[in-house]
Amino acid sequence: EEELQVIQPDKSVLVAAGETATLRCTATSLIPVGPIQWFRGAGPGRELIYNQKEGHFPRVTTVSDLTKRNNMDFSIRIGNITPADAGTYYCVKFRKGSPDDVEFKSGAGTELSVRAKPSAPVVSGPAARATPQHTVSFTCESHGFSPRDITLKWFKNGNELSDFQTNVDPVGESVSYSIHSTAKVVLTREDVHSQVICEVAHVTLQGDPLRGTANLSETIRVPPTLEVTQQPVRAENQVNVTCQVRKFYPQRLQLTWLENGNVSRTETASTVTENKDGTYNWMSWLLVNVSAHRDDVKLTCQVEHDGQPAVSKSHDLKVSAHPKEQGSNTAAENTGSNERNIY
């Protein structure tokens, strides 16, 4: 009778993570008597995957009933495949012996490759806010994919970015891989509503790439512009001085009025108006009684925005001449109870 051969018909098998792998193996004879075992890898360090007669292998099932007298099908199924299961699997026939069973014949091996989806890309921006015209870095990370080939693109508001560097680790063979990319983005004053998108394409995603996003509203700081104006209101001896704070982001802002260098009032921006580009406007005003003044008054609007050093704009109030209209009130609303008399 012809000597037993162990046949593994599949040189390779490709399985998606989470699915079941079927590894086929048949023997050409019932003789010699002895069990079939499956191993991953070869040599002394090989890992036992299945033993026909003993051992605990909860993920493994046999395709056919190995207790049938004439069974020569030793194919197995391995459930819930992960990238860690990748490798070459050998179906090995043993001959019963003493003290231990003796390896008799091995199949040629079946290489199991595992396709694993990348994790959802996570995009993170700089720890501190930056102002327009500055360049900031964004990172994108995705993990756990296999095979190694992967494509990563960066977009800002739908426009593809070109200034980025990408690494896939590890460089050598591995059960799964990670990608890390850093993109440089130049901020503009219009970026409050902008988004940076990291897009990852992989064979497991069937043409439907994964995206991670970062809102530039978390990154940008648009400093305000200040304008101080005056116009007469009510009685002729009263002047309304307004401080227009325009185009700032984020909203966190504190305004202080100074009269001849002395603090008059401090307030926090509350009822702001939002511009189409996502920045904010706000106006504060002060009523000044000039009738008792012999000298000019220097009024300063000082703004501290988002914890940054204060910026200020001053206005000289002439008290010698009859107050004339200087500038116009361009704000739709006045805020707070801001009357202030100077005696």
Partner: antibody, heavy 114, light 108 residues
């Protein structure tokens, strides 16, 4: 449901023999080796040997060679452990264990006493 | 035959304490063939860890196993009262198969 049902308490005289049984249900006994393990009171576990019920082939730990004999009857899905020339050293609990190692019988307590 | 030596033979641990039990083999054992059992008084042993590091069904994740060659260990990250039991390592790498002498783990 997989179960291994072992015979009850045995009290035997020194020098005699005893045959312990282990009846399997919920699986085909021929699909796995069947192991036997000894545990003396408050002691460790000792591997006695294993049998392949499919063909009766068996392996023994050197210590139990000549002392223990394992057999199996596939028609009744039962494995047996025969212990001969009993002494007080054989007083112990004897377990049968399916080859996949996660299913154990409840144990048979053997007392050798005159 | 391969002799498995477990240490310590007996130990006690406080709740929340990290516990490590060791199993040393007299000659190399392939990690696929090194198992651990838990046994409580009056009960049959229960398969606890198989193939060195895989937890059997129902075993809490505070348990872990590791090792290779001649040195293996079972670790409990945070000891609980229900972990008080005897633990045995077992090799079926070569005949005769052997158990370690066991470690009796008590709760303080």
């Amino acid at each position: 449901e997989v179960q291994l049902q072992q015979s009850g308490v045995e009290v035997v005289q020194p020098g005699a023999s005893v045959k312990l049984s282990c009846t399997a249900s919920g699986f085909n006994i021929e699909a796995y080796y069947m192991h036997w393990v000894k545990q003396r009171t408050e002691q460790g576990l000792e591997w006695i040997g294993r049998i392949d019920p499919e063909d009766g082939e068996s392996k023994y730990a050197p210590k139990f060679q000549g002392k223990a004999t394992m057999t199996a009857d596939t028609s009744s899905s039962t494995a047996y452990l025969q212990l001969s020339s009993l002494t007080s050293d054989d007083t112990a609990v004897y377990y049968c264990v399916r080859g996949s190692y996660e299913y154990w019988g409840q144990g048979t307590t053997l007392t050798v006493s005159s | 035959q391969i002799v498995l030596t477990q240490s310590p033979a007996i130990m006690s641990a406080s709740p929340g304490e990290k516990v490590t039990l060791t199993c040393s083999a007299s000659s190399s054992v392939s990690s696929s063939y090194l198992y651990w059992y838990q046994q409580k008084p009056g009960s049959s042993p229960k398969l606890w860890i198989y193939s060195t590091s895989n937890l059997a069904s129902g075993v809490p994740p505070r348990f872990s196993g590791s090792g290779s060659g001649t040195s293996y260990s079972l670790t409990i990250s945070s000891m609980q009262a229900e972990d008080a039991a005897s633990y045995f390592c077992y090799q079926w790498s070569s005949y005769p198969y052997t158990f370690g002498g066991g470690t009796k783990l008590e709760i303080k």
